[in-house]
Interface confidence: low
């Protein structure tokens, strides 16, 4: 099989979001309710489902999240802009892993990420986008513990 | 006490228009999500529509049709319903209804004011 | 839209007795219910949330259940003053079907 990779800069993505994390977590109306749930979803993914969900998991930010936020500061939303620029670009990578055939979703991934889209359905649109976004680091942090997994099938 | 109070009822000639007004008091307004509903005389409950406390959202169900906007002011601690097109159809008494602190049960209503009725008639 | 389906319209029951009132979603709500009790000439009261929780100061004599499409609210040792009419009420927000603040058609318990 081929490599499958992602040349995103992770940690640039991560400084971005650091910068805007306090600002964002500050809108957080419901703090002991998560979308993302705290990785308990994302744990229990194979190795052979990780690049369907982070395909699932990049579709649900640039679909949605990023669609449904409407912030108001223009230094926040640049950052947020970079951030789904660089989704944007993952995604189009993983379409090429998708060609490949190297990104199946099989039953359990398809599940996990639904688990997350009803979790952000209970939510007023934009609460839930802030919810959302604040939880990016969980996100983050999902990619970089599977790093490996996801660069090379 | 925390207690809502709608005002603003009364009889209105089919196709006018009538503001009905949600005093809060005992609690923020702001900090909640609030809904209106609507209950022609002997029949049942019918959603109106809900105002976000953070964003300041709205929606409707789909019958309202751009007929009926809600707005709130929150240094006044109140609500507003404006009825415009009004026709006898519309003829109820209006509650505000407040949803409760819980995020998954934010469209559930824990607070009622005693409503105000709206008699639509020639 | 969500369609909320209330059955029995009316239903009489003695004291001491039991009532069973049954609400049906169009779709899954997912436990996203909520009962109300509404007296004439007053305003709804909470009864149940989430489908089972009973609400502050509540008694226990009401017991909600279900979770999907099919909800049951149960009045047992039933009182004088429990004669009222019953809402169900859906509160399950999705974004493709939007709000679902829809409520059914109401139940009219009689207390002989």
């Known amino acids: 099989l081929r490599r499958c990779l992602i040349s995103t800069d992770m940690h640039h993505i991560e400084e971005s979001f650091q910068e805007i994390k306090r600002a964002i977590q500050a809108k957080d109306t419901f703090p002991n309710v998560t979308i993302l749930s705290t990785l308990e979803t994302l744990q229990i993914i194979k190795p052979l489902d990780v690049c369907c969900v982070t395909k699932n998991l990049l579709a649900f930010y640039v679909d949605r999240v990023f669609k449904d936020h409407q912030e108001p500061n223009p230094k926040i939303l640049r950052k947020i802009s970079s951030i789904a620029n660089s989704f944007l670009y993952m995604q189009k990578t993983l379409r090429q892993c998708q060609e490949q055939r190297q990104c199946h979703c099989r039953q359990e991934a398809t599940n996990a990420t639904r688990v997350i889209h009803d979790n952000y359905d209970q939510l007023e649109v934009h609460a839930a986008a802030i919810k959302s976004l604040g939880e990016l680091d969980v996100f983050l942090a999902w990619i970089n513990k599977n790093h490996e997994v996801m660069f090379s099938a | 006490q925390e207690q809502l109070k709608e005002s603003g009822g009364g009889l209105v000639q089919p196709g006018g228009s009538l503001k009905l007004s949600c005093k809060a008091s005992?609690?923020?307004?702001?900090?909640?999500?609030v809904s209106w509903v609507r209950q022609a005389p002997g029949k049942g409950l019918e959603w109106i529509g809900y105002i976000d406390p953070v964003f300041g959202s709205t929606y409707y169900a789909n019958w309202v049709n751009g007929r009926f906007t809600i707005s709130s002011d929150n240094a006044q601690n109140t609500l507003y319903l404006q009825l415009n097109s009004l026709t006898a159809a519309d003829t109820a008494t209006y509650f505000c209804a407040r949803g409760s602190g819980y995020v998954y049960y934010g469209y559930t209503y824990d607070l009622w004011g005693p409503g105000t009725l709206v008699t639509v008639s020639s | 839209d969500i369609v909320m389906t209330q059955t029995p319209a009316s239903v009489e029951a003695a004291v001491g007795g039991t009532v069973t009132i049954k609400c049906q979603a169009s779709?899954?709500?997912?436990?996203?219910l909520s009962w109300y009790q509404q007296k004439p000439g007053q305003r709804p009261k909470l009864l149940i949330y989430?489908?089972?929780n009973l609400a502050s100061g509540v008694s226990s004599r009401f017991k909600g259940s279900g979770s999907g499409t099919e909800f049951t609210l149960t009045i047992s040792d039933l009182e004088c003053a429990d004669a009222a009419t019953y809402y169900c009420q859906s509160y399950y927000y999705s974004s493709s079907s939007g709000y679902g603040n829809v409520f059914g058609g109401g139940t009219e318990v009689v207390v002989k």
């Open positions: 989430g489908a089972s």
């Open positions: 005992g609690f923020d307004l702001s900090s909640y999500g």
């Open positions: 779709q899954s709500i997912y436990r996203y």
